[in-house]
């Protein structure tokens, strides 16, 4: 059957933890991505931002996991209105910001 939202979110959090704590060199060679609003629809927005990073094996699993949270297909170059299109940040900071937001959602019991 389908994976419960809380389990899927836990797995995503644990993957993001792995990424943030296992950095031995700049994540994705210091690639920059669009910052996003961490609000409703953030999973699709996060995927839209990260999918533009190619050739970075460290975040491939995260990209796959985010696609499971996003109801529509996302492809490179696609952007929604959820992006703060004037701000680019390093992938490492993007991942840490996303991780913190997801941890807070989990603390509040908001799994969906």
């Amino acid at each position: 059957g389908p994976v419960p939202p809380s389990t899927a979110l836990r797995e995503l959090i644990e993957e993001l933890v792995n990424i943030t704590q296992n950095q031995k060199a700049p994540l994705c060679n210091g690639s920059m991505v669009w910052s996003i609003n961490l609000t409703a629809g953030m999973y699709c927005a996060a995927l839209e931002s990260l999918i533009n990073v190619s050739g970075c094996s460290a975040i491939e699993k995260t990209q796959r996991m985010l696609s499971g949270f996003c109801p529509h297909k996302v492809s490179a170059g696609q952007f929604s209105s959820l992006h703060v299109r004037d701000t680019k940040i390093e992938v490492a900071q993007f991942v840490k910001d996303l991780l913190l937001h997801l941890k807070k959602l989990f603390r509040e019991g908001r799994f969906n």
Epitope: R10, I13, E14, V17, N18, T20, Q21, N22, Q23, K24, A92, K96, L100, K103, K104, F106, R107
Partner: antibody, heavy 122, light 108 residues
Framework: QVELVESGGGLVQPGGSLRLSCAAS????????INWVRQAPGKGLEWVSG????????LYADSVKGRFTISRDNSKNTLYLQMNSLRAEDTAVYYC???????????????WGQGTLVTVSS | SYELTQPPSVSVAPGQTARISCSGD??????VSWYQQKPGQAPVLVIY???DRPSGIPERFSGSNSGNTATLTISGTQAEDEADYYC??????????FGGGTKLTVLG
């Protein structure tokens, strides 16, 4: 308000055993990771052990692994630490400390009890 | 195992800014908490998730964390801020880990 009250400390001989308890109130006990942290006299903080909200995960510092056992009874809102084969270096104030959330990645303490002193000496 | 390093002591004049550092390998990849401990008392959380303040903690306390160093900043330090301060974080290998502590002295 969040309250954590430790008990069970005292004087014990090397090689002896002691069981600490921590009574929790003021929050939903079964939704949080809980830790034991100790502080030797005049020294810094040392994390000892922690347990997930549902007891599904228990973790220990290398210094106590195999000698200490953490457990919890969510029906009684109580945390325990069974300490066996005690050594002089285990002498410390033992604090019960709630984690920020339910899981290991949120185990960093937010609220602390006042502590209970364990003295291991002959 | 993961280690956090703090200066043993920091001194500051009343009303000035105190900065306490906490260094560790890629500490910026973790979330740092800061605890205040006064003699004979239990630690009190003053900063968590790098720069969030629990309710009841004065705005003069703030935190930052990037690279290999996290910093606790106390702006307009008051006499009542004199205490030991510990940084702490969670690491996948060591689990909860604390720095050795920094004694903050408010001069005068």
């Amino acid at each position: 308000q969040v309250e954590l009250v430790e008990s069970g400390g005292g004087l014990v001989q090397p090689g002896g055993s002691l069981r600490l308890s921590c009574a929790a109130s003021g929050f939903t006990f079964n939704s949080y990771w809980i830790n034991w942290v100790r502080q030797a006299p005049g020294k810094g903080l040392e994390w000892v052990s922690g347990i997930a909200y549902d007891s599904s995960n228990t973790l220990y510092a290398d210094s106590v692994k195999g000698r200490f056992t953490i457990s919890r009874d969510n029906s009684k809102n109580t945390l325990y630490l069974q300490m066996n084969s005690l050594r002089a270096e285990d002498t410390a104030v033992y604090y019960c400390a709630r984690g920020l959330g339910a899981f290991h990645w949120d185990m960093q303490p937010d609220y602390w009890g006042q502590g209970t002193l364990v003295t291991v000496s002959s | 195992s993961y280690e956090l390093t703090q200066p043993p002591s920091v001194s500051v004049a009343p009303g000035q800014t105190a900065r306490i550092s906490c260094s560790g390998d890629n500490i910026g990849g973790t979330f740092v908490s800061w605890y205040q401990q006064k003699p004979g008392q239990a630690p009190v959380l003053v900063i968590y998730d790098d720069n969030d303040r629990p309710s009841g903690i004065p705005e003069r306390f703030s935190g930052s964390n990037s690279g290999n160093t996290a910093t606790l900043t106390i702006s307009g330090t008051q006499a009542e801020d004199e205490a030991d301060y510990y940084c702490g974080t969670w690491d996948m290998v060591t689990n909860n880990v604390f720095g050795g502590g920094t004694k903050l002295t408010v001069l005068g």
